[in-house]
């Protein structure tokens, strides 16, 4: 088996790479500033923490997260290392682009990558769907579509919905596993005889998912208080954000090993599982007022993630062509589902007693948000997925899906695993 | 006791650049969100800024937007606003005000608890 | 947008006040009270609708129907003579309304 790209490829990744690097450098060379105001340096370290947390979780969590391929492990972590930092620099710009710049150059603040992480964060969820099946010049472009979309998706919330920063985002959920399920659903599907075991996950790269997974775990929180305004909301998302996923682990580990004839407890179902609750949690964790109703929600997704996770992967496999270990999109859909559900019931409670049908009114604009993510997902999903499919990018023939050889250089092998 | 304390307020010239202060005691801008509202003379109250309690986002109204900076120095525990291109609609009494927020059912409500006696700018040539 | 009426109201010590508020667009119950005598700070009465800064005497209260907020003083004092803004927190910019001046009769 041949360790080198295919020659067009070899042409075409670099090319199409760093020209696309270089026009960002000119981009933010004609039209960004760094911010100038006068601020305090403890305020700046404070404001940077989040952002290191943030690109923690990014970088080595939904890095290792994905590696659990028993021969793709490389190509996940650094692809995904690849598509963090070109998918930061996009998001920097279109997001300054968007809300910025009719005053004129876009003001690049920590803010701004501290959002601009959590928008490439967005892609690393959804290519958990089409990881092994691409290579790095198609993953450029499901960056740059998934971003933008991303981005005027937020824009238009914001300024039809008035939503804050906040209920924006936390739409990422919902947004990436549909938009990962719809790419997924549109590239070639069947895994040639013989090669079956290469998407079947193996004890190292487990291990190293599993990193990725507690990694994710421990800041989740970070990633759920981020764009809050106030203290005391950020201190209630954490509070919550932490009770949902501490939850949610006890519930993976117990839920997996009822689920199992044997009582055995499933790598995959934990990797996904112990985050259920920080995902069902994101839309309301600032508003949840007490620990026991964060808990409860922990302990609902768990079942839900552990449920899907058993039910899911054959109909997920047999349609979308996605492995049994790439269980990411199928989770965040269901679990962002609960999640924005639980807002609305939030949101009904709250205008009972408004009268002039402003219930109904509300629902329904919360309603309106959710399915205009979910549309656009689904059709800048389909749009990527057709975009993947051109010949010009030379997609890895289906025999050598899931396979670092494919990409990488191996100086101790001279053939095969 | 929680106070506010504008300064920086005077007579400038069209075009021309003031910066006010506002002093905060018996609490941290570290964990306070701050506004500054302004009342024209006649007028009723118009926000101008805000900046949160981190310092990570600052909000503008759309008649300042460009030429006034919110920024502060939370190691002098003061509020900044830096005006610049100054005209004279911009003359009028400037409020700093502290933000609060509370937990709603849906979302949480933000409000001004405490607010400073203000300083007055006048832009006239 | 907020509209306030009326935009002035001569009334006698203990008499019952009704402001009134009215948003453009659906604001929730993000909605504020502010109370402004010249050359004072402005002072907050009531926040989120109904709910009573501490300090704040009882006589004071919202509510909400709607788009519609009202702020009623029950029995007017002399202090109470000022004037009072409404104010929305649901989305920047944090708009005013124009104001009510209450004077004496």
């Known amino acids: 088996m041949s360790s080198k790209y295919p020659r067009s490829v070899r042409r075409c990744l670099p090319l199409w790479a760093l020209t696309l690097e270089a026009a960002l450098i000119l981009l933010f060379y004609f039209f960004t500033h760094y911010d100038a105001s006068l601020e305090d340096q403890k305020g700046l370290v404070a404001s940077y923490q989040v952002g290191q947390d943030l690109t923690v979780m990014a970088a080595i969590g939904l890095g290792f997260l994905t590696s659990s391929f028993r021969r793709h492990s490389w190509s996940s972590v650094a692809f995904n290392l690849f598509m963090l930092a070109l998918g930061v620099q996009w998001a920097i710009l279109l997001d300054g682009f968007l809300s910025q710049f009719p005053s004129g150059k876009v003001v690049i603040t920590l803010f701004s990558i501290r959002l601009a992480t959590m928008s490439a964060l967005s892609v690393l969820i959804s290519v958990d769907a089409v990881l092994g099946k691409v290579n790095l010049a198609q993953l450029v472009v499901m960056v740059l579509v998934e971003v933008t979309a991303l981005g005027n998706l937020r824009m238009v919330i914001s300024n039809i919905f008035n939503t804050d920063y906040h209920m924006n985002m936390m739409h990422i959920y919902v947004f990436a596993a549909y938009f990962g399920l719809s790419v997924a659903w549109c590239l070639p599907k069947p895994l040639p005889e013989g090669t079956e075991d290469k998407d079947q996950t193996a004890t190292i790269p487990s291990l190293s998912a599993m990193l990725g997974a507690l990694f994710l775990w421990m800041f989740w929180p970070s990633f759920n208080s981020a764009l809050l305004r106030s203290p005391i909301e950020r201190k209630n998302a954490v509070f919550n954000t932490y009770y949902a996923v501490a939850v949610s682990v006890v519930t993976a580990i117990s839920g997996s090993s009822l689920a199992h004839p044997q009582g055995k407890i499933s790598k995959t179902y934990v990797h996904s599982a112990v985050l259920a609750g920080g995902v069902a949690v994101g839309t309301s964790c600032h508003l949840i007022p007490s620990p026991w109703l964060a808990m409860v929600l922990g302990l609902v997704a768990g079942l839900i993630s552990v449920g899907g996770a058993k039910y899911l992967p054959g109909c997920c496999n047999r349609v979308l062509g996605i492995p049994h270990s790439s269980i990411m999109g199928y989770n965040f859909s269901l679990l962002g589902l609960l999640g924005e559900i639980i807002y609305i019931v939030l949101l009904v409670l709250d205008t009972v007693g408004a009268g002039n049908g402003m219930i109904g009114f509300q629902v329904l604009l919360s309603i309106g948000e959710l399915s205009l993510a979910i549309v656009i997902a689904l059709m800048s999903g389909l749009l990527t997925g057709l975009l993947l499919n051109l010949k010009i990018w030379k997609a890895p023939h289906e025999a050598k899906y899931f396979d670092d050889q494919v990409f990488w250089k191996f100086p101790h092998l001279a053939v095969g695993f | 006791q929680v106070k506010l304390l504008e300064s920086g307020g005077g007579v400038v010239q069209p075009g021309g650049s003031l910066r006010l202060s506002c002093e905060a005691s018996?609490?941290?801008?570290?964990?306070?969100?701050m506004h500054w509202v302004r009342q024209a003379p006649g007028k009723g109250l118009e926000w101008v800024a805000l900046?949160?309690?981190?310092?990570?986002?600052?909000s503008y109204a759309e008649s300042v937007k460009g030429r006034f900076t919110i920024s502060r120095d939370t190691s002098k525990n003061t509020l900044y606003l830096q005006m610049r291109s100054l005209s004279a609609d911009d003359t009028a009494v400037y409020y700093c005000?502290?933000?609060?927020?509370?937990?709603?059912?849906?979302?949480?409500?933000?409000?001004?608890?405490?607010w400073g006696k203000g300083t007055t700018v006048t832009v006239s040539s | 947008v907020l509209t306030q009426s009326p935009s002035s109201l001569s009334a006698s010590i203990r008499d019952r006040v009704t402001i009134t508020c009215r948003a453009s667009?659906?604001?929730?119950?993000?909605l504020n009270w502010y109370q402004h005598k010249p050359g004072t700070a402005p002072k907050l009465l009531i926040y989120?609708?109904?709910a009573l800064q501490s300090g704040v005497p009882s006589r004071f209260s919202g509510s909400r129907s709607g788009t519609d907020f009202t702020l009623t003083i029950s029995s007017l004092q002399p202090e109470d003579f000022a004037t009072y803004y409404c104010?929305?927190?649901?989305?920047?910019?944090?708009?005013f309304g124009q104001g009510t001046n209450l004077q004496i009769k």
């Open positions: 005000a502290r933000d609060k927020a509370v937990r709603g059912i849906s979302r949480y409500n933000y409000y001004m608890d405490v």
């Open positions: 018996g609490f941290t801008l570290r964990s306070s969100g």
């Open positions: 900046i949160w309690f981190d310092g990570s986002i600052r």
């Open positions: 667009q659906n604001i929730g119950s993000y």
């Open positions: 989120a609708v109904s």
């Open positions: 104010q929305q927190s649901y989305s920047p910019p944090y708009t």
